[in-house]
């Protein structure tokens, strides 16, 4: 099947790498600079993909394979094969379309990307604040107060929010 | 094909002023977000400001505020970037780029960014 096919097509013939010119008789021609093909019997070649501004190279294009990018510092990568790139922000903050803005008290992110999640919620599991929460960091439950031995005390847990909003800088 | 292509940048003194402008092409410009972000000498992208598609909202990095202003114009498939009372630490190369499909809903990433035009603030 292969031995007629080639036969019927020339240009299947023609390996990664290289492209079948019909300007010049189906002759397999070498990709053109920033181009490349691959798979073999292509009649054209893709155009390398090109890692600038907030994107930066990760592997070259070659004739057979298209360039990989990854983000520049500061960035990280989003989709498939780093099709985007989004900001990174500091642990203790989340993205929003203003900029980096600090976790709602309440909230933590121990991240440079992502949101602010809840801090855990101890007494839904019966248990008590053993450390209390920042921005950055969930709270610690330790045991339920009734584990405690008589004298021991756990940590007060936080007072809730008044109103939602950011955390004092 | 999808281009966006920086100019205006330059050497300026303390305090002056540029304008940076960004053509783009090979795309449906008032569909989307734009953005600036700059690269300072060895260091990291920082986002300075973005857009969103009619220009009714704009947002700025606090290092940026009052002294920057993005503006757009659909027609002309072009953003810009006014920078007043220039400070040393505005040096940089700065970048257009394109929010990707879905900025601003579940993620802000950007997808097409130009070459950079380097601004340059030293008395």
């Known amino acids: 099947f292969e031995r007629t096919r080639s036969l019927q097509d020339p240009c299947s013939n023609c390996p990664a790498g290289t492209f079948c010119d019909n300007n010049r008789n189906q002759i397999c021609s070498p990709c053109p600079p920033n181009s490349f093909s691959s798979a073999g019997g292509q009649r054209t070649c893709d155009i390398c993909r090109q890692c600038k501004g907030v994107f930066r190279t990760r592997k070259e294009c070659s004739s057979t394979s298209n360039a990989e990018c990854d983000c520049t510092p500061g960035f990280h990568c989003l989709g498939a094969g780093c099709s985007m790139c989004e900001q990174d922000c500091k642990q203790g903050q989340e993205l929003t379309k203003k900029g980096c803005k600090d976790c709602c008290f309440g909230t933590f992110n121990d991240q440079k990307r992502g949101i602010c999640r809840p801090w855990t919620n101890c007494s839904l599991d019966g248990k008590s604040v053993l450390v209390n929460g920042t921005k950055e960091r969930d709270v610690v439950c330790g045991p339920s107060p009734a584990d405690l031995s008589p004298g021991a005390s756990s940590v007060t847990p936080p007072a809730p929010a008044r109103e939602p909003g950011h955390s004092p800088q | 094909e999808v281009q966006l292509v920086e100019s205006g940048g330059g050497l300026v003194q303390p305090g002056g002023s540029l304008r940076l402008s960004c053509a783009a092409s090979?795309?449906?410009?008032?569909n989307y977000w734009m953005n600036w972000v700059r690269q300072a000498p060895g260091k990291g992208l920082e986002w300075?400001?973005?857009?969103?598609?009619?220009?009714?909202?704009?947002y700025y990095v606090d290092s940026v505020k009052g002294r920057f202003t993005i503006s757009r114009d659909n027609a002309k498939s072009s953003l810009y970037l006014q920078m007043n009372s220039l400070r040393a630490e505005d040096t940089a190369v700065y970048f257009c780029?394109?929010?990707?499909?879905?900025?601003?809903?579940?993620?802000?990433?950007?997808?097409?960014s130009g070459q950079g035009t380097t601004v340059t603030v030293s008395s």
């Open positions: 780029a394109r929010g990707g499909e879905g900025y601003g809903i579940d993620h802000y990433g950007l997808d097409v």
């Open positions: 300075v400001a973005n857009i969103n598609q009619d220009g009714s909202e704009r």
């Open positions: 090979g795309f449906t410009f008032s």
